[in-house]
Amino acid sequence: FERTRSLQDPCSNCPAGTFCDNNRNQICSPCPPNSFSSAGGQRTCDICRQCKGVFRTRKECSSTSNAECDCTPGFHCLGAGCSMCEQDCKQGQELTKKGCKDCCFGTFNDQKRGICRPWTNCSLDGKSVLVNGTKERDVVCGPSPADLSPGASSVTPPAPAREPGHSPQ
């Protein structure tokens, strides 16, 4: 079948990095500069992606593969193949329409991207709190108190008032 196909379609012999040039009796021609073909038998080469502005080149375009972009410092990729760059925030913040905003009390974000998430509720599993949450870190739960079996509630001690220079416990 492959032999028959190649007899019928000479373009199938054109390897990646070339295209089947109809203007030149279907001769395999190299892809022109700033273009590529990643598979054989192509009738055209694709234009290379250009990484401009907030995008920067992670991998240069070659005759057989497209360029790959990532984002300049202070931004991170979103979407398939880094189709967009979104502004970074600090840990303990999330990006809103008005820019980076601190996580509300009871929520945290331990990354430079994404949204603030609620602290784990240790008491839902009948567990104690070993380390209280902060804007940047989730709560750490610990063993169940002796006077409560797993599943019981009201084991999370109230968060102490913040002391200057420290996060709460």
Epitope: V129, L130, V131, V140, G142, S144, H166, Q169
Partner: antibody, heavy 122, light 107 residues
Framework: EVHLLESGGGLVQPGGSLRLSCAAS????????MGWVRQAPGKGLEWVSI????????YYADSVKGRFTISRDNSKNTLYLQMNSLRAEDTAVYYC???????????????WGQGTLVTVSS | DIQMTQSPSSLSASIGDRVAITCRAS??????LAWFQQKPGKAPKSLIY???SLQSGVPSKFSGSGSGTDFTLTISSLQPEDFATYYC?????????FGGGTKVEIK
Amino acid sequence: EVHLLESGGGLVQPGGSLRLSCAASGFTFSSYAMGWVRQAPGKGLEWVSIIGGGGGSTYYADSVKGRFTISRDNSKNTLYLQMNSLRAEDTAVYYCAKVGYSGTYGGWFDPWGQGTLVTVSS
Amino acid sequence: DIQMTQSPSSLSASIGDRVAITCRASQGISNYLAWFQQKPGKAPKSLIYAASSLQSGVPSKFSGSGSGTDFTLTISSLQPEDFATYYCQQYNSYPLTFGGGTKVEIK
């Protein structure tokens, strides 16, 4: 590298008091619960007490409840164990240990200090 | 209180042997179990947490398994440095409790 160094052990008479200290370095002290575990000569390990990262939560073994008090000074990266009304059965090596956690749950001890010997005898 | 029962209390084994130590909890503790190694005159060292997770820096010859009430620490090929006492610890609930220890000796 995490380093824990206990001090304050020694010989004390029954009914007496002693205060153990544990100087911590190599990690963000206030972000970790800390604990004390003891080991009587030739015996196994016995948990004594745990204190939460900010000092607000404390837990004790029944054998020491009402006599021992765990505390911490996060500004000095130091953990304490105040031991009152000491008894012969409190004789042991006392280890300070950082409480390990993975994700949002913890409660085991890693690492441990080298220990300090408390001997209660007349 | 949750009682932790280790068995055997001691065992003799040869270099290269596969060794298994068991720990049984008096009630279910999910996977809230740790294993420690202690050599004479030294502080305990954490080997395994969450029943089967290897502590950073611990060689892969140590492995842990189990959930609920029955747990096992396995040393795949015993080496001279592995002769020590091993303890389990539950951290499902207070009071935290340790097993009585298993002393691994040279045969």
